[in-house]
Interface confidence: medium
């Protein structure tokens, strides 16, 4: 892995097994298989993993043994293609098995499903979970990896090992506690929420690499690492970017063993060189490997060096701007991005990338002009509106959030986004708008200097969820346009969308607004989702409904649910009062 490629290992599978150790090797192979074959039963995957592990051990013993020289893609792909029910379960994905590597792996990757048709994970009683944990800890933890990986086919594999370690620690501690539930449930809730966030963040990284290419990912990484490590030199940041890009390219490409191995190497490099990277790494670097890598990924921004010179000197006033740009465009733009980002931890990464794009466009135009310097002299003035737009948007939305609270703020966004893109499926609109609404409690509490990086970069992650879900079944040209034209302008693109005047309102269907007594036993969150689903449907039926009209109907709906859940004969109440509610709502909305 040097600057010069060493002789390749005789057996790649033996090399990775030795580097990672048996436990991590097995866990990563299970994650890889579950992310590819998302519908296969747990037992089938465990069997495949055990077969691969036994084979790897023979290669460790003798790297020259038969098939040990095959690539990991060949070995894993061959193993996946032995699944007997491939055609029945996965349909056309079975055609991948007729292809040769590397086309076969690409084919498997294309069939990863961001929204697989799998039952929701229901959490058993605490005693049931603790018994299962004690009866067979290994199987219990493998099941966790399997269930998460198949539902999140782009989950960052080495990070999932970290989650599994915390999951195990939670059960180890809490199953011995006096009040098991009080100990365990908050920990599981925290892991679930963090896991969803981690999955969504990684999904954006993979989308960036796969849809917009390595250059886009590297630009993102330069900006983010320069904010985080402002004391590091450009060459050091560049090296970290190259290494990080390799790690994420591997994980997004299904090369999970290589990814985990290289991530460990990168953590080692960062900790060995922390003096030239950041003063904030000391605590992270004292932790064990999985915690260390996670800690580094989340580490706070280092302090900015004092007395950084003005950017204008090198990037506007210098006579060599066009010469330097022409010499090595990406290196020069990388230096610009590095210098700008290390000075602006208060900007979102996507804003920094918009500024760099504006700078690049200006140089492209001006370096071909008669008087380049005159042409690009005012380039920094063009940045002002780009900076003010997210600042103003965040200010307005934080004010709205503080006024409404999270649930009603989510509802405002539900209405806003349903009017923008009413063709999108109701579950997707509910999921995405609820997540967009969480930006309030996540970011509005921060001081001004931290609001924008928190809010806009979080919104990029959430809007990517919309983009990947919509890509599976495209229904809106407007969504496709905002998702595909520019990665860094997705949020401004969606913000700029007005009500879709071409939308033909959905036919009214009373069944959509028929509720039953089961709503009473739901958790508060589930009840909110039911109400928000109804709200989206209302807007789809009546896109021109005013805020006041919708509020009146939703208030009636809340009162109806509360009344019937207190009734002795709940089901009869829901049936009779429900009819009245539907009629009243139709009248209120003029349907």
């Amino acid at each position: 892995r040097g600057v010069f490629r060493r002789d390749a290992h005789k057996s790649e599978v033996a090399h990775r097994f030795k580097d990672l150790g048996e436990e991590n090797f097995k866990a990563l192979v299970l994650i890889a298989f579950a992310q590819y074959l998302q519908q296969c039963p747990f037992e089938d995957h465990v069997k495949l993993v055990n077969e691969v592990t036994e084979f790897a051990k023979t290669c460790v013993a003798d790297e020259s043994a038969e098939n040990c020289d095959k690539s990991l893609h060949t070995l894993f792909g061959d193993k996946l293609c032995t699944v007997a029910t491939l055609r029945e379960t996965y349909g056309e994905m079975a055609d991948c098995c007729a292809k040769q590597e590397p086309e076969r792996n690409e084919c498997f990757l294309q069939h990863k499903d961001d929204n697989p048709n799998l039952p929701r994970l229901v959490r058993p009683e605490v005693d049931v979970m603790c018994t299962a944990f004690h009866d067979n800890e290994e199987t219990f933890l493998k099941k966790y990896l399997y269930e998460i990986a198949r539902r999140h086919p782009y989950f960052y594999a080495p990070e999932l090992l970290f989650f599994a370690k915390r999951y195990k620690a939670a059960f180890t501690e809490c199953c011995q506690a006096a009040d098991k539930a009080a100990c365990l449930l908050p920990k599981l809730d925290e892991l679930r929420d963090e896991g969803k966030a981690s999955s969504a963040k990684q999904r954006l990284k993979c989308a960036s690499l796969q849809k917009f290419g390595e250059r886009a990912f590297k630009a993102w990484a330069v900006a983010r690492l320069s904010q985080r490590f402002p004391k590091a030199e450009f060459a050091e940041v560049s090296k970290l970017v190259t290494d990080l890009t390799k790690v994420h390219t591997e994980c997004c490409h299904g090369d999970l063993l290589e990814c985990a191995d290289d991530r460990a190497d990168l953590a080692k490099y960062i900790c060995e060189n922390q003096d030239s990277i950041s003063s904030k790494l000391k605590e992270c670097c004292e932790k064990p490997l999985l915690e260390k890598s996670h800690c580094i990924a989340e580490v706070e921004n280092d302090e900015m060096p004092a007395d950084l010179p003005s950017l204008a000197a090198d990037f506007v006033e210098s006579k060599d701007v066009c010469k330097n740009y022409a010499e090595a465009k990406d290196v020069f733009l990388g230096m610009f991005l590095y210098e700008y980002a290390r000075r602006h931890p208060d900007y979102s990464v996507v804003l920094l990338l918009r500024l760099a794009k504006t700078y690049e466009t200006t140089l492209e135009k001006c370096c071909a002009a008669a008087d380049p310097h005159e042409c690009y002299a005012k380039v920094f003035d063009e940045f002002k509106p780009l900076v003010e737009e997210p600042q103003n948007l965040i200010k307005q939305n934080c004010e709205l959030f503080e006024q409404l609270g999270e649930y009603k703020f989510q509802n405002a966004l539900l209405v806003r986004y349903t009017k923008k893109v009413p063709q999108v499926s109701t579950p997707t609109l509910v999921e995405v708008s609820r997540n967009l609404g969480k930006v309030g409690s996540k970011c509005c509490k921060h001081p001004e200097a931290k609001r924008m990086p928190c809010a806009e970069d979080y919104l990029s992650v959430v809007l990517n969820q919309l983009c990947v879900l919509h890509e599976k079944t495209p229904v809106s040209d407007r969504v496709t346009k905002c998702c595909t034209e520019s990665l860094v302008n997705r949020r401004p693109c969606f913000s700029a969308l007005e009500v879709d005047e071409t939308y033909v309102p959905k036919e009214f269907n009373a069944e959509t607004f028929t509720f039953h007594a089961d709503i009473c036993t739901l958790s508060e969150k589930e009840r909110q989702i039911k109400k928000q689903t109804a709200l989206v449907e209302l807007v789809k039926h009546k896109p021109k409904a005013t805020k006041e009209q919708l509020k009146a109907v939703m208030d009636d709906f809340a009162a109806f649910v509360e009344k019937c859940c207190k009734a002795d004969d709940k089901e009869t109440c829901f049936a009779e009062e429900g009819k009245k509610l539907v009629a009243a709502s139709q009248a209120a909305l003029g349907l």
């Epitope: 892995r1 560049s238 190259t242 390799k246 010499e327 090595a328 465009k329 990406d330």
Partner: nanobody, 126 residues
Framework: EVQLVESGGGLVQAGDSLRLSCAAS????????MAWFRQAPGKEREFVAG????????RYIDSVKGRFTISRDNAKSTMYLQMNSLKPEDTAVYYC???????????????????WGQGTQVTVSS
């Protein structure tokens, strides 16, 4: 981090030849571009020649084109600079550099390189 060590410098007459070597040890992850830079007394360090990972792309400054040849042997982790028809103005300390590999291959910009050797002195007398 990667370590680079240059060798092969020395004192020669104008018109003679020299072959510089740059041996790499340690590691970095990616396929790196590599280059030779030089710094003459009282002058700034300047790019001389660069080569990409696969040796497919090489580039030179105009003043050495046709006289210098850059090459690399990945199996030996070594890069070379064959210098023929040396001139007094080639006198300088020659540095070997390993690039960060993102952006232009074998860039002429110093900032594109993350690892540097200590340098080897080349003196050409007339």
């Amino acid at each position: 981090e990667v370590q680079l060590v240059e060798s092969g410098g020395g004192l020669v007459q104008a018109g003679d030849s020299l072959r510089l070597s740059c041996a790499a040890s340690g590691r970095t992850y990616s396929r790196n571009a590599m280059a030779w830079f030089r710094q003459a007394p009282g002058k700034e360090r300047e790019f001389v020649a660069g080569i990409d990972w696969s040796s497919e792309n090489t580039r030179y400054i105009d003043s050495v084109k046709g006289r210098f040849t850059i090459s690399r042997d990945n199996a030996k982790s070594t890069m070379y600079l064959q210098m023929n028809s040396l001139k007094p103005e080639d006198t300088a300390v020659y540095y070997c550099a390993a690039g960060t590999s993102w952006g232009a291959l074998a860039s002429r910009l110093e900032a594109a390189y993350s690892s540097w050797g200590q340098g080897t002195q080349v003196t050409v007398s007339s």
